[in-house]
Interface confidence: low
Amino acid sequence: SDKLYQRKEPVISSVHTKVKGIAEVTENVTEGGVTKLGHSIFDTADYTFPLQGNSFFVMTNYVKSEGQVQTLCPEYPRRGAQCSSDRRCKKGWMDPQSKGIQTGRCVPYDKTRKTCEVSAWCPTEEEKEAPRPALLRSAENFTVLIKNNIHFPGHNYTTRNILPTMNGSCTFHKTWDPQCSIFRLGDIFQEAGENFTEVAVQGGIMGIEIYWDCNLDSWSHHCRPRYSFRRLDDKNTDESFVPGYNFRYAKYYKENNVEKRTLIKAFGIRFDILVFGTGGKF
């Protein structure tokens, strides 16, 4: 209840996260032009990326374009990109939708289609659907430890969500263990009323809300966090212009002294940690 006699102050907060878990993925692996089936192991360094601010990202799905090299090649025949003669292709033109700079030539992409030749990382990325089910669907069982330090400078009071008495092997549960700061990703989605398996395909943004309602008076002191969860992105993927959450990154390597890269379009969940609340003291 609102204590009108108290002086209220908003929380100042810092957050640090640590994700743990191993995923195993069955996928086609291309080695020396030969495609083989392989099981790949993904650890924390493979599926998490450092983000600025109170966020962390877990990759749940991906599309790879392997063995790209900087050269000339036909661009991917996306809608409106096909040509029948050089006239359609403008030398030096950079179409924002294209993956390179046009050379002015119309060249065969395959047996039936021709597209403008581009100077780019080749072969250019194909427009592929995200694999379904998601390749790292087992990320549902990953856990995240959230360390949250808070401060009320006006009241000269500092605390954190992790208590010395906490068990490092606990897992957050709304009823049985509401103060545990280790969260299973699948449980976060369940609490938010969302289906992890479904969101993992295209990616999404999930909010972890930490609410501090602190009474700092010595006679009725209470200052512990309350956790809640909600999805922050537009879940209507069919209707939204760019569904889900994804970005591209590349792994570079040299083969016969030629720089090459593997382009990875990573789909996943960005977790935003939103800390709010007040501290009140007489």
Partner: nanobody
């Protein structure tokens, strides 16, 4: 000493089911696979499962009929064979691989069981 011991083979009518088991001792493998060899034919890939029991892959001829699963606690891999056909008649071998690459190729499997005979009569 590494040992892979298969069991569960036998004679079954077309359309019937069998479950093969393979108990592993002496080593833990990253990938476990089942292969089969019919008389006068080459050894053929059937199915593989990674360390994560959810992670499995099947040969085209058995997709939708066979299920591979793994119990890491018991060091056992199973092959549940449903809707069996006479062309499934073969000796079935269990194999273990320390590698997770190219798991449909028998070359990566370092350790093999003795095999168990499966006969499907029409």
């Amino acid at each position: 000493e590494v040992q892979l011991v298969e069991s569960g083979g036998g004679l079954v009518q077309a359309g019937g089911s069998l479950r093969l088991s393979c108990v592993v001792s002496g080593r833990t493998f990253s990938a476990m696979g089942w292969f089969r060899q019919a008389p006068g034919k080459e050894r053929e890939f059937v199915a593989t499962v990674g360390w994560n029991p959810m992670n499995s892959y099947y040969g085209d001829s058995v997709k939708g009929r066979f299920t591979i699963f793994r119990d890491n606690a018991k060091n056992t891999v199973y092959l549940q064979m449903n809707s069996l056909k006479p062309e499934d008649t073969a000796v079935y071998y269990c194999a273990g691989s320390g590698s997770l690459l190219d798991v449909t190729s028998e070359a990566v499997y370092t350790d093999w069981g003795q095999g168990t005979q499966v006969t499907v009569s029409s």
